[in-house]
């Protein structure tokens, strides 16, 4: 697994460098998670043809994966810093159950899957420190999440592979949108 942000050899070699600002740390954390997702997607796509054929193979997708919409204030048009930050944190909290599902879904990238999960928890903490309106952030219900996890794990092999692909693709898109938005803040 890649080394978490702040622990790479460049940091060790440059002890006199200015410490990262909160925004820089968040930016770096997201890019680190995106690298991890990239590695996981590589394994998923190599294992099956899910990545090319998901459009034709699926008629309907009812996985309620977080997605950015106009009303969330994260796009350039209608940008709203506070609304957007709440959406990013809420979305990441909602993704956590899906990241838990990804554990044990990888053979050669098991550590990578764990790193993505743990780094996301750290990212949420960074963002919560940045947010002024923490009351607006709704935390998913643990009982609902446990039931969702059980249902996801009960699917057959093909559906689980497809679910894995869809989670990684959506999480990547969500993080990319978050990164663009956070750079405007």
């Amino acid at each position: 697994a890649p080394v978490p942000p702040g622990e790479d050899s460049k940091d060790v070699a440059a002890p006199h460098r200015q410490p990262l600002t909160s925004s820089e740390r968040i930016d770096k954390q997201i890019r680190y998670i995106l690298d991890g997702i990239s590695a996981l997607r590589k394994e998923t796509c190599n294992k099956s043809n899910m990545c090319e054929s998901s459009k034709e193979a699926l008629a309907e997708n009812n996985l309620n994966l977080p997605k950015m919409a106009e009303k969330d204030g994260c796009f350039q048009s209608g940008f709203n810093e506070e609304t957007c930050l709440v959406k990013i944190i809420t979305g990441l909290l909602e993704f956590e159950v899906y990241l838990e599902y990804l554990q044990n879904r990888f053979e050669s990238s098991e550590e990578q899957a764990r790193a993505v999960q743990m780094s996301t928890k750290v990212l949420i903490q960074f963002l919560q420190k940045k947010a002024k309106n923490l009351d607006a952030i709704t935390t998913p219900d643990p009982t609902t999440n446990a039931s969702l996890l059980t249902k996801l794990q009960a699917q057959n092999q093909w559906l689980q592979d497809m679910t894995t692909h869809l989670i990684l693709r959506s999480f990547k898109e969500f993080l990319q949108s978050s990164l663009r938005a956070l750079r405007q803040m």
């Epitope: 193979a57 997708n61 009812n62 249902k151 996801l152 009960a154 057959n156 559906l159 679910t163």
Partner: nanobody
């Protein structure tokens, strides 16, 4: 364990109609996505149609769109395939399938968990 049993197949002239039924023994029928597939000798199993849990969303292969209609009756644990304007190329063994996945509606056989034995449909010209 879910048992699926198709009926309604037979020999029909081109332009004619048939209605296939698939009865399920499972008590949780309404939680399954139901689909119809067909297969001709020496060819791969082909997707025909699928219907979501509630019956609100229906999907068809391009080759049958506008001619075939899928429906389900959750009270009777049965899914139907109404086939109109039949063509000789519709000749195949028709299989009913159930997918227990609670989130995705697949168009490929690997996404389905349970299969019926199949019913022969022959369309003569």
């Amino acid at each position: 364990q879910v048992k699926l049993e198709e009926s309604g197949g037979g020999l029909v002239q081109a332009g004619g109609s048939l209605r296939l039924s698939c009865a399920s023994s499972g008590r949780t029928f309404s939680s399954y996505v139901m689909g119809w597939f067909r297969q001709t000798p020496g060819k791969e199993r082909e997707f025909v149609s699928t219907i979501n849990w509630s019956g609100s969303n229906k999907y068809y292969a391009d080759s049958v769109k506008g001619r075939f209609t899928i429906s389900r009756d959750n009270a009777k644990n049965t899914v139907y395939l109404q086939m109109n304007s039949l063509k000789p190329e519709d000749t195949a063994v028709y299989y009913c399938a159930a997918s227990a996945g609670g989130f995705l509606v697949p168009r490929v056989g690997q996404g389905y968990d349970y299969w019926g034995q199949g019913t022969q449909v022959t369309v003569s010209s």
